[in-house]
């Protein structure tokens, strides 16, 4: 008889989830020499251990600690790029600017990017039918807790000048409820981080406003300054050429680094 399974509001675990995580791990460790020592089977076991046979609305950051330990990775100072509500552009940026890292350019972020997963209490099965939705079901679900955990760690280990890419087309350019606003901002370490520089990406072709004067950016500046970290903000006008360079990084004018 088919066992009764709780119906959640979110989509179920991504198909072929174990194989995907393992394959991504192997690929990442092959491409990044500094992570060659990582045993991908152990990584998968630690990942699995964080959520398998656990009630998917009761996951804690503690559950992910073995995985975090195995995936420890050092991002060089001045090379951390945070983002909020502008993921694709941030990732396109680091695809060209190879020496800079978003969370998803690190091993743990790369493993989980765009994936969904959850298990169920008291069974070793993965739930491919449905998983808890952050809003409709619970916030302490496997995916949300994972990103909160690794985002916290990513921010804690950042050093030097940290950059953040923000979406100037959003009504809240800085959103206190985003992962950046609720986790990363509060876990930058003042003794290691000299400054946070925000890049506000303009969407409109003729939007000449100074979006660094936006009230939400002023709020970000206030939070950062109170933590004794210097804050800078730049309007990124005319991003079209930047986007062209993303498509054609061999263009001679795209090769000059930051």
């Amino acid at each position: 008889l088919p066992r009764w399974r709780q119906q959640w509001s979110g989509s179920g675990t991504t198909s072929r989830f174990p194989e995907t995580v393992l394959a991504r791990c192997v690929k990442y460790t092959e491409v990044h020499p500094e992570m060659r020592h990582v045993d991908c089977q152990s990584v998968w076991d630690a990942f699995k251990g964080a959520f398998i046979s656990k009630y998917p609305c009761n996951i804690t950051e503690e559950d992910y600690q073995p995985l975090v330990k195995l995936g420890t990775q050092t991002v060089p100072c001045n090379k951390t790029l945070l983002w909020s509500r502008i993921k694709d552009l941030a990732h396109q940026f680091t695809q060209v600017q190879r020496d800079m890292f978003t969370l998803e350019d690190t091993l743990l972020g790369y493993l989980a990017d765009d994936l969904t997963w959850c298990g169920e209490f008291n069974t070793f099965e993965i739930n491919y039918q449905s998983c808890p939705d952050w809003r409709k079901d619970c916030s302490n679900n496997p995916v949300s807790v994972f990103w909160k955990t690794v985002s916290r760690r990513f921010a804690e280990t950042a050093c030097g000048v940290v950059h953040v890419m923000l979406n100037g087309s959003r009504s809240k350019i800085f959103d206190k409820n985003s992962t950046f606003g609720s986790v990363e901002v509060h876990n930058l370490q003042p003794e290691k981080v000299q400054a946070l520089e925000a890049w506000v990406i303009h969407g409109g072709r003729e939007d000449s406003r100074d979006l660094c004067q936006d009230p939400t950016i002023k709020e970000l500046e206030s939070i950062i300054s109170k933590r004794n970290i210097r804050f800078f903000c730049k309007n990124i006008y005319r991003p079209e050429k930047f986007l062209q360079c993303v498509k054609n990084p061999e263009d001679s004018s795209c090769l000059s680094g930051i």
């Epitope: 600017q97 303009h202 072709r205 100074d210 660094c212 903000c233 730049k234 795209c254």
Partner: antibody, heavy 122, light 107 residues
Framework: QVQLVESGGGLVQPGGSLRLSCAAS????????MHWVRQAPGKGLEWVSN????????FYADSVKGRFTISRDNSKNTLYLQMNSLRAEDTAVYYC???????????????WGQGTLVTVSS | DIELTQPPSVSVAPGQTARISCSGD??????VSWYQQKPGQAPVVVIY???NRPSGIPERFSGSNSGNTATLTISGTQAEDEADYYC?????????FGGGTKLTVLG
């Protein structure tokens, strides 16, 4: 090597028209935005107008909006500035300049022509 | 629109440091470039993106930009640095230049 050569300047009466040209060579003209910048005798630089590499967007300083039109012919490697309803205060050396982009977010003028003098006087 | 204000003139002894300011409302939120113009010549970019030096520009030229002021610094100023200097910035629709500063190298 990159070369920008302006032509078409001269003496014109107030209210008159003039068309400036800028012949570009030594680079792929169709890949670069272009600008006109002017400098009145003994005065500072004033940005006039900008056109995207493919001609899709044009921008003007408030002082010339509605009177000047920037255009380009990528097949001829030439930039133009059509100047109508000219005034005495438009008297200046007019430079064309190449819009340089540097990864990730920087724009500036990296090559300039030697300029052509436009004198508006009765 | 952006408005950029520069001092009309700055004097410096050879070998000393010259600083040319460019002030504008929250100019630190935008990128600034600097141009050198010698008499009868077209301008030449010496700094772009606040503090980047194009190839061929001597290391003595540097830039900074925060708050309401961008600054061009010339360390160990030489006689050949005597020229007019213009700051410039841009937004989505406009480019703009400061009024220019005449740098005089004394002696």
């Amino acid at each position: 090597q990159v070369q920008l050569v302006e032509s078409g300047g001269g003496l014109v009466q107030p209210g008159g028209s003039l068309r400036l040209s800028c012949a570009a060579s030594g680079f792929t003209f169709s890949s670069y935005g272009m600008h006109w910048v002017r400098q009145a005798p003994g005065k500072g630089l004033e940005w006039v107008s900008n056109i995207y590499s493919d001609g899709s967007n044009t921008f003007y300083a408030d002082s010339v909006k509605g009177r000047f039109t920037i255009s380009r012919d990528n097949s001829k490697n030439t930039l133009y500035l059509q100047m109508n309803s000219l005034r005495a205060e438009d008297t200046a050396v007019y430079y064309c300049a190449r819009n340089m982009y540097r990864w990730p977010f920087h724009y500036f003028f990296d090559y300039w022509g030697q300029g052509t003098l436009v004198t508006v006087s009765s | 629109d952006i408005e950029l204000t520069q001092p009309p003139s700055v004097s410096v002894a050879p070998g000393q440091t010259a600083r040319i300011s460019c002030s504008g409302d929250n100019i630190g939120n935008k990128y600034v470039s600097w141009y050198q113009q010698k008499p009868g010549q077209a301008p030449v970019v010496v700094i772009y993106g606040d503090n980047n030096r194009p190839s061929g520009i001597p290391e003595r030229f540097s830039g900074s930009n925060s708050g309401n002021t961008a600054t061009l610094t010339i360390s160990g100023t030489q006689a050949e640095d005597e020229a007019d200097y213009y700051c410039s910035s841009y937004d989505s629709s406009y480019f703009v230049f400061g009024g220019g500063t005449k740098l005089t190298v004394l002696g």
